[in-house]
Interface confidence: medium
């Protein structure tokens, strides 16, 4: 058995070897609704007396409450290895972000390297064409914007089931219609490497002039 190390003063702490989180995976890319697990680990020598628990942070905010994290301690003669496990079941786009661990050792805050989680899915519309009434043979604009990840997101426009632009445009896209003589249905298709999403069709009606 080994004897406990003497209490370390703040002056002496400057002489202690630096402690840091071990390197871990830097970037995790996965599809929506998959499960993900990652961890931070650190080895604390016995010479360090004052340690606090590991906390998880995302994009600069501490993760509290319902998140699933487990901390495991593995003591041996030289100190203790601490592994903090974090898991997310059925990831969503809102889980995208930079995750890292924090821990206080001898009143010094230690921060891990970030773990970037990128949740990929089909394009998601944040702006799509809206139904409008237009004057016959008068130009008007329609807007479509969709995001990933993954990026880039490319836009195709469809008018009455026929494609308008043969080459895709990067999102966001504005379609200028030179004018219509009759009612038409427009939709936009947003493409990325995961698949394509088709917006709701919108009816563009011709105003009846009294």
């Amino acid at each position: 058995a080994h004897t406990a190390a003497p209490q370390v003063t703040s002056t002496a702490s400057k002489l202690l070897p630096p402690v840091a989180f071990n390197h871990t995976i830097g970037h995790i890319v996965l599809s929506e609704h998959k499960n993900v697990k990652f961890n931070c680990s650190i080895n604390i020598p016995n010479t360090y007396q004052e340690t606090a628990g590991i906390s998880w942070w995302k994009d600069g905010k501490e993760l509290l409450g319902a998140h699933h994290s487990i901390t495991q301690f593995y003591p041996d003669e030289e100190g203790v290895s601490i592994i903090a496990l974090f898991s997310i079941a059925s990831v969503q786009r809102s889980d995208n972000g930079s995750y890292f661990c924090k821990m206080k050792v001898n009143n010094r805050e230690i921060v891990s390297d970030p773990i970037y989680v990128e949740v990929q899915g089909l394009p998601y519309f944040i702006k799509q064409p809206e139904s409008v009434n237009v004057t016959r043979n008068t130009a008007f604009n329609l807007t479509c914007q969709a995001v990933g990840p993954p990026e880039p997101v490319n836009i195709f426009w469809v008018q009455n089931s026929s494609r308008v632009n043969e080459k895709p445009e990067r999102s966001p896209s504005v379609l200028t219609v030179p004018g219509l003589t009759e009612t038409a249905v427009f939709s936009c298709e947003a493409h990325n490497d995961k698949g394509l999403t088709v917006s709701k069709g919108v009816h563009i009606n011709i105003k009846v002039i009294p």
């Epitope: 786009r93 899915g121 089909l122 469809v158 490497d193 394509l196 088709v198």
Partner: antibody, heavy 128, light 111 residues
Framework: QELVESGGGLVQAGESLKLSCKAS????????ISWVRQAPGKGLEWIAY????????NYAHSVKGRFTISSDNAQNTVFLQMPSLTASDTATYFC??????????????????????WGPGTLVTVSS | DPVLTQTPSSVEAAVGGTVTIKCQAS??????LAWYQQKPGQPPKLLIY???TLASGVSSRFKGSGSGTEFTLTISDLECADAATYYC?????????????FGGGTEVVVK
């Protein structure tokens, strides 16, 4: 969840057939359904696609203007109308459903590029 | 229009061995590639999609890699049940003017 094809058989060149693909245990309107055929001893050839909930249809160059894909949403069934058949149309015809996409929002069509669920196939033989 | 070329057309390997199948696209398809396994008298079964994502319920002995124009399916610790024809597949175009394209297939014989 399953797809079952029917309507295949032996026909003379120039005759017509209508194939059916019945879906069960599937929210029919929320997926794309394709027909893929395979000539005896040959590879796979995609021929037509429909997104029943949106009425989107799409055809391979080899059958465009000749074959027609349609659906009966109430019956959860997709059809492939094949007029004027030739010997080169002899194949096993499979229907296949798009990969699940559970991240979607109601009211949009989602195409995931891949086929996750296949029917057992129905054999069409065209004799000349 | 992209064309998918699979090599080899046939490969033979022993139980416990490893097989590598290549799929080359005539133009860049990013990571839009799937691999299927088909046994005689059966429909194809999705193994890998998005070039490297394992489909649900598929053994981790199957591994997909690559992007752009060069893709690989690796089957390790071969089992007799792996004897089948393997196809790669991509998609291009839009919802109303898009096409699914298959490679010519690779037959895997397990000794």
């Amino acid at each position: 969840q399953e797809l079952v094809e029917s309507g295949g058989g032996l026909v003379q060149a120039g005759e017509s057939l209508k194939l059916s693909c019945k879906a069960s245990g599937i929210d029919f309107s929320s997926y794309g359904i394709s027909w893929v055929r395979q000539a005896p001893g040959k590879g796979l050839e995609w021929i037509a696609y429909i997104y029943p909930g949106f009425g989107i249809t799409n055809y391979a160059h080899s059958v465009k203007g000749r074959f027609t894909i349609s659906s009966d949403n109430a019956q959860n069934t997709v059809f492939l109308q094949m007029p004027s058949l030739t010997a080169s149309d002899t194949a096993t015809y499979f229907c296949a459903r798009d990969l699940d996409y559970t991240g979607g929002v109601v009211g949009y069509a989602y195409v995931t590029y891949y086929f996750t669920l296949w029917g057992p196939g129905t054999l069409v033989t065209v004799s000349s | 229009d992209p064309v998918l070329t699979q090599t080899p057309s046939s490969v033979e390997a022993a139980v416990g061995g490893t097989v590598t199948i290549k799929c080359q696209a005539s133009e860049s398809i990013s990571s839009r590639l799937a691999w299927y396994q088909q046994k005689p008298g059966q429909p194809p079964k999705l193994l890998i999609y998005s070039a490297s994502t394992l489909a649900s319920g598929v053994s981790s002995r199957f591994k997909g890699s690559g992007s752009g124009t060069e893709f690989t399916l690796t089957i390790s610790d071969l089992e007799c049940a792996d004897a089948a024809t393997y196809y790669c597949q991509t998609y291009y175009g839009g919802s109303t003017t898009g096409w699914y394209v298959f490679g010519g297939g690779t037959e895997v014989v397990v000794k």
